[in-house]
Structures are given as C-alpha cells and as structure tokens.
C-alpha cells in the first residue's frame, strides 16, 4: 500500500459516571497509516503536557496500521470542569495530526427529595401500619446517605433503604436515584408526629418533612387535567381523542368522568383506572372520541369529574387554540458522516425538521415501505427556532449497522404536520445519495449550531 498519514478518532467512555472511580480514561485511535512509525503525545487545552499516558502496539489491518493511546486523568481534576477536552497529538512521517478528545462531563447535581405519605385508608394489619416513602432523584455522584427522623430524632426501627440506581436517560450526565421506606404505626401518624427524610449528599443536607397535619384536605388534593388530541394521534389513528386525567384519588370506586359538548350534550366516555402510585393514590383516565371537524371548528369540550372526596364536581374545558399561524416544515435528510462509517460500527442518519408551526409534529422512519421499530430511532421534542419566533425545529436520529448502510438499503423519513399540503412529506436517502448534500453541508452545520 502507499504511504499515508493517520486519521485520528477520539475514544471516550460511554459511561457517564467517572465520579465513582479515582481516574478518568480517554483515548485516541490513529487509523490507516503507513509506514508503521507513529508517536503519540497528549496535552491539556492550555498546551501543558500530560504524562500519565499508555500506548498500545500498532495493528496491521488491510495493508495499513492502526494504533491507540490512552491517557488517565484524576477524576477530581475532570470534575472541576476546567478542561472540556484534551489534545491528542500524533507524529508520523507522512504528516503530523492532532485531535481534541472531549472529557466526560461529570455533573455534580443535588438530589430532589420527595416524601410520599399514606392516605387515610392506607393502613393495614394489627397493629395498623403503613409506609412513608422517600425518593431522592437526579443526583450525581452516586454516594448518598438517607436517614429518617421522628420529631427531629433519628429513627432506627422500620427503615429500609434500597441500593442506589442509575436513572434511565438517553443523554446527559448519569444521574442516580434512591428510595427509602419507613414503616410507621397508624397511631404514630395520626398522633401528628413530624417525620423527616434527611438526605446527605456532597456535604449538603436536604430535608423533606411529612406529617398527617400537612396532608391537604381530600377535597383539594384531586387534580384534573384536560388533554387535547395530538396531531400525531389524529394522523396515526384517524381519530380525535379527548383525554381527561384525574390524579391523587384516595379511592377509585366512586370516580366518574364525563365529557360534554359546548351545548351540554354528553360524549360517550370510556374510563380506565390506573394502578396505585408510590404515594398510595390512584389515577383515572376518561377518553372520548370526537370528529376532527368538530375539534377544528374551535368547539369547547368540558370534562366533569365527581368523587366522594369532592364536595362538588371538578371541571376542565378545552378547545383548539385559535389564531395559531400554520407554517409547514422543511425536511432535510443527512446521511452518516464518513468518519463514522470508517469506524465500521454503526451508521447514523439524521432527519432535520425545521421552521414549522404549531409545534405538534410526527416523525416516522421507513425501510422498503415498512415502518421501522421505534426502538431504532429517537426523535427530539420540538424546540423553538431561535431565529424565528413562533416556529419550531426537531430532529430524529436513526441508527443502523454500517453493513446495512453499505448494502445500499434506502431509508425514508416521513414527517406529518397539519400545515403540509397532504399532511405528510417524506425524504429518502441511501448510500448512493451520500455525497449529494455536500453543497448544503455548511448550511446544516449552521442549523446544528442553533
């Protein structure tokens, strides 16, 4: 093969929790170089040298060489966040290269502490007992201590604290959650003792109190949310569904939910009771189907909720918002980056949807005319366009294997929005169209920068 300079790729850990270890490792992959003569060096952003490096022997692959270098940085240094990247430098007879290698973001995030209390009828057994549940969520790093106080004094009996767990997240720093339960006697709860869940994290103390004195009257606890039909549901199911969500029910046997039209005429409502929640309350959902034209006309629909805990029915009214400007979306389909394909692992296809109004949009991916499983792609929530008030943009990312992409398989991004002439538009991309967006690449970069 002919002599060639290396191509550099940053290597960073997929795990976002280096706070649990004393050091953070990042690496640098040099690929496709010849001859086999390469020297790695690492520098901080300020150009000072990093000494704790480790090199790995080069490997011959397809007539060219590949090599990696790793650097170990103390967690506490990374945690201060002064350097968002380090620089990997490579010397090679056919040219020197350098690459910024991003450092993992180690967020120090405080816990959000919530205490769930039993309802009046939530005590069982003889003597009657129930549980107070304390949840600390969204914190990082994972080291945390949870304790319970009763009237300001530490409680030792009836405390169970679960293992700290990582929260399921698609992006951002890894955060953690922990649950602690305190089993209490009904006599203690009704005696209006003050219980406190105390959470100690990174030298700070977070406290949440709970007492039967502080539990709001039942007639004010129940909440009703009237949820309008989404464009996505209208587009997918061809039906316009009104949803009435009722939360914080202490009992479920006496709830009724009904939808009525502006003229008082009842709309057939189907009610579902959910399971009980951690705080021992129930939720109920009342759904009613209406004609899309009735919804689009701006007619008002009212949800009415009755329950034994309510002195009078609760009502919520909704209608389609008036005067919302319609702007159809522009749709751009971006093929995988060549650098990514060179890694021979996966291929990421991006569907960029911009400039639309209202914010309700539906994105779906198709392959050979068949919808792809939603697990294969992720679609962002619509976000306001910074340069165009009242308009929104969203993106959907489909990940396929590099082999699938290289077979020439076509992928279609289908976008549905009420401002589109036929309510739907689509864009298709495959390996052969890979280079065709190059003329607009700069424009896309600008879009991403927003």
């Amino acid at each position: 093969g002919s002599a060639s300079a290396p191509t550099l790729f940053p290597l960073v850990s997929c795990e976002n929790s280096p706070s649990d270890t004393s050091s953070v490792a990042v690496g640098c992959l040099a690929q496709d170089f010849l001859p086999d003569s390469i020297t790695f060096s690492w520098k901080y952003k300020n150009n000072s040298d990093i000494s704790s490096t480790r090199g790995f022997p080069s490997v011959l692959r397809g007539g060219k060489y590949a090599a990696t270098s790793q650097v170990l940085l103390p967690s506490k240094d990374v945690m201060q966040g002064t350097d968002e990247h380090v620089v990997c430098k490579v010397q090679h007879p056919n040219g020197n290269k350098e690459k910024n290698v991003p450092l993992p973001v180690i967020a120090e995030l405080p816990p959000k502490v919530s205490v769930f209390v039993p309802p009046r009828d939530g005590f069982f057994g003889n003597p009657r007992k129930s549980k107070l549940i304390c949840q600390a969520t969204g914190f990082s790093p994972r080291q945390i201590q949870v304790s319970w106080l009763r009237e300001g004094k530490q409680v030792g009996s009836g405390v169970t604290t679960d293992q700290v767990q990582a929260e399921a997240k698609e992006s951002g720093p890894t955060t953690y959650k922990v649950t602690s339960t305190l089993t209490i006697k009904e006599s203690d709860w009704l005696g209006q003792s003050m219980f406190t869940c105390r959470v100690d994290h990174r030298g700070l103390t977070f406290q949440q109190n709970a007492s039967s004195m502080c539990v709001p009257d039942q007639d004010t606890a129940i909440r009703v949310f009237a949820i309008p039909p989404s464009f996505a549901s209208i587009f997918l199911t061809k039906s316009t569904k009104l949803t009435c969500l009722v939360t914080d029910l202490t009992t479920y046997d006496s709830v009724t939910i009904s939808w009525t039209r502006q003229n008082g005429e009842a709309v057939k409502t189907h009610t579902n009771i959910s399971e009980s929640h951690p705080n021992a309350t129930f939720s109920a959902v009342g759904e009613a189907s209406i004609c899309e034209d009735d919804w689009n006309s701006g007619e008002r629909f009212t949800c009415t909720v009755t329950h034994t805990d309510l002195p009078s029915p609760l009502k919520q009214t909704i209608s389609r918002p008036k005067g919302v400007a319609l702007h159809r979306p522009d749709v751009y389909l971006l093929p995988p980056a060549r650098e990514q394909l060179n890694l021979r692992e996966s291929a990421t296809i991006t569907c960029l949807v911009t400039g639309f109004s209202p914010a309700d949009v539906f994105v779906q991916w198709m392959q050979r005319g068949q919808p792809l499983s939603p697990e294969k792609y992720v679609t962002s929530a619509p976000m306001p366009e910074p340069q165009a008030p009242g308009r929104y943009f969203a993106h959907s990312i489909l990940t396929v294997s590099e082999e699938e992409w290289n077979t020439g398989e076509t992928y279609t991004c289908v976008v549905a929005h009420e401002a589109l002439p036929n309510r739907v538009t689509e864009r298709t991309v495959d390996k052969s169209t890979e280079g065709e967006v190059s003329a607009d690449e700069e424009g896309f970069e600008n879009l991403w920068a927003t």
Partner: antibody, heavy 117, light 107 residues
Framework: EVQLVQSGAEVKKPGESLKISCKGS????????ISWVRQMPGKGLEWMGI????????IYSPSFQGQVTISADKSISTAYLQWSSLKASDTAMYYC??????????WGQGTLVTVSS | DIQMTQSPSSLSASVGDRVTITCRAS??????LNWYQQKPGKAPKLLIY???RLQSGVPSRFSGSGSGTDFTLTISSLQPEDFATYYC?????????FGQGTKVEIK
Amino acid sequence: EVQLVQSGAEVKKPGESLKISCKGSGYSFTTYTISWVRQMPGKGLEWMGIIYPSDSDTIYSPSFQGQVTISADKSISTAYLQWSSLKASDTAMYYCARSSVVGFDVWGQGTLVTVSS
Amino acid sequence: DIQMTQSPSSLSASVGDRVTITCRASQSISSYLNWYQQKPGKAPKLLIYAASRLQSGVPSRFSGSGSGTDFTLTISSLQPEDFATYYCQQHLSWPETFGQGTKVEIK
C-alpha cells in the same frame, strides 16, 4: 383458647446458631402480629421486634437490628427468632407475644436460652 | 426512641393498701400506654390498655389514668396475689419501649 406455645429451653455454646419457635392457636395467625421480648436475668422487658405474618414485614428495635432474625411460617402458624452466632450476653428468657391495637394481649410461656462455654 | 421512666423502682405495702405507680414518657404518647403485671417465673400479663381501659378478666381494683406524658397505675386495695413487678409500655411508635419496672413487695 387463644394461646402461644414456645419451644423448650436451650443450652448453647458461644458462636453456635439457634432458632426458637412460637406457635399460635385459637385465632387467625395472619390477622395479628407477633412481637419478641427479651428479659435478661433479674432485668426488665426489652422489645426486640415484630413480624406481620400476612406479608412477613418485620420491624426491629435498633438494639437488635442485625443481631437476630425474626421470621414466620403462616402455613403452620409459627413465628421464629434466630441467631447465627450466639454470645454469652444472649443468655435470657425470650417471650413471644401477640401484638394488637391494644398491646401485647397474649404471651407465650417463654424460652430460656443459656449461652455458656 | 421514646424513653419510659417508672417510679418508684420498688415499694413495700401491706394487703389492703392503696398503691400508686407512676410512669413518665420522654414525649407525648397520647393514650398509647399499657400496664403489665409479671410474677416470678411467669410471662407478663396485660392489665390496662389505652392508659385507662381494663383488659378483660382483670379485677376492677386495678385502674389507670393519664394522657400525654404522665400516667398512673392504681391498685385500690392490694391483695396477696398482686405482689409482682409492674411495667408500663408505650405503643405509639416503634420501637415499643417499656419502663424499667416497679417491684411491689410485702411489707
């Protein structure tokens, strides 16, 4: 007749394990709870912990947490108190008692545990 | 934990005497207080629950009073079978705690 019958006296060596029992009869075993109470020689009563046989939920006194294990087998209406490694200081009379809203209304006859090398 | 303090720790009395034993809680326990009687070599027996209610089968010479933090057990006319140790116990919250006991002896 409502009663709790405990297993017989035990003589053990330090470091040995032990499980004593308390069998309920004459009432619905899962409707009530069972508490265990220790009485060291010449001393007062100390509440050790409680078990709800219906769901096996246990609550321990901080003084006994990790020192003993309370369990129950509702199919044979029996509660248990066990040690994995006895100490000389575990020498005492152990009572099981039926707990209810009013307190400990029925007591077992007691099991004397002697730990000596 | 809620501490229970009994007084006196022991007393000597004669048959027919009126005997009073007091119990104090380290914090308010409303009426969640029981009294037990224990005779040597026997299991304790519930006498009074909810501070003042007589357990079924217990003679009426036993009575209880009090609420909050201060409680009293009274034996209106001491009988020979009443010589024993008496314990108060709070059951408002876990851990349930007993007083250290009051031994009633024959004078």
